[in-house]
Interface confidence: medium
Amino acid sequence: LTCLGGFASPGPVPPSTALRELIEELVNITQNQKAPLCNGSMVWSINLTAGMYCAALESLINVSGCSAIEKTQRMLSGFCPHKVSAGQFSSLHVRDTKIEVAQFVKDLLLHLKKLFREGQFN
């Protein structure tokens, strides 16, 4: 039985697939944006010294009650090796610098597209 149409493939998802799916989700968010994303909520800007995915998750996890980014939050947690919870504030953030969630998602999407194009899947 080599073909199991409609079933999830067994074993871990390849990094390239996970990254492509995250990109696709961010594309969906940016394209389907009617009203201001997450009611114009602001998130901390990030620096990358301890890993982009964890930093992005730490920023977005503090946005509550926004169903549009819940799937993104779950997907990012799959890329981050440690547990991230709301209220965490680490060196991954740029203090006193907040931007709108919509801008953050757009920036993250462009960066991930670049990584995908360059074959950097981890």
Epitope: S45, I46, N47, L48, T49, M52, A55, V94, I99, Q103, F104, D107, L108, L110, H111, K113, K114, R117
Partner: nanobody, 119 residues
């Protein structure tokens, strides 16, 4: 709203040094390549240097290689250009520019800061 604000320009003697800064806001600074571009009086734009996320690798025009150093501090959303062994031909308005991740072209510019190298 994306904003880039350069500072640090001025008058310096040949052989001297200057450090330019560019304060960025309105976007996730850490995720983008950032560049310095200059325009000498009566001349066109000339690319000077580019730095990638996390600060490595960096790229330089041949005309400044070994004399200029680009750096960034993502914790301060700030881009820098350390300019040493300045020459008269380095006289220009220096612009900080954000590089679009996919198109690989400059999509936002600062207002520029003037560097004059003269004795």
């Amino acid at each position: 709203e994306v904003q880039l604000l350069e500072s640090g320009g001025g008058l310096v003697q040949p052989g001297g040094s200057l450090r330019l800064s560019c304060a960025a806001s309105g976007f996730t600074f850490a995720l983008y390549d950032m560049s310095w571009v200059r325009q000498a009086p009566g001349k066109g734009l000339e690319w000077v240097s580019t730095i990638t996320p996390l600060g490595s690798p960096t790229y330089y025009a041949d005309s400044v290689k070994g004399r200029f150093t680009i750096s960034r501090d993502d914790s301060k959303n700030t881009l820098y250009l350390q300019m040493n062994s300045l020459r008269a031909e380095d006289t220009a308005v220096y612009y900080c520019a954000k590089v679009h991740s996919v198109e690989n072209e400059f999509d936002y510019w600062g207002q520029g800061t003037l560097v004059t190298v003269s004795s």
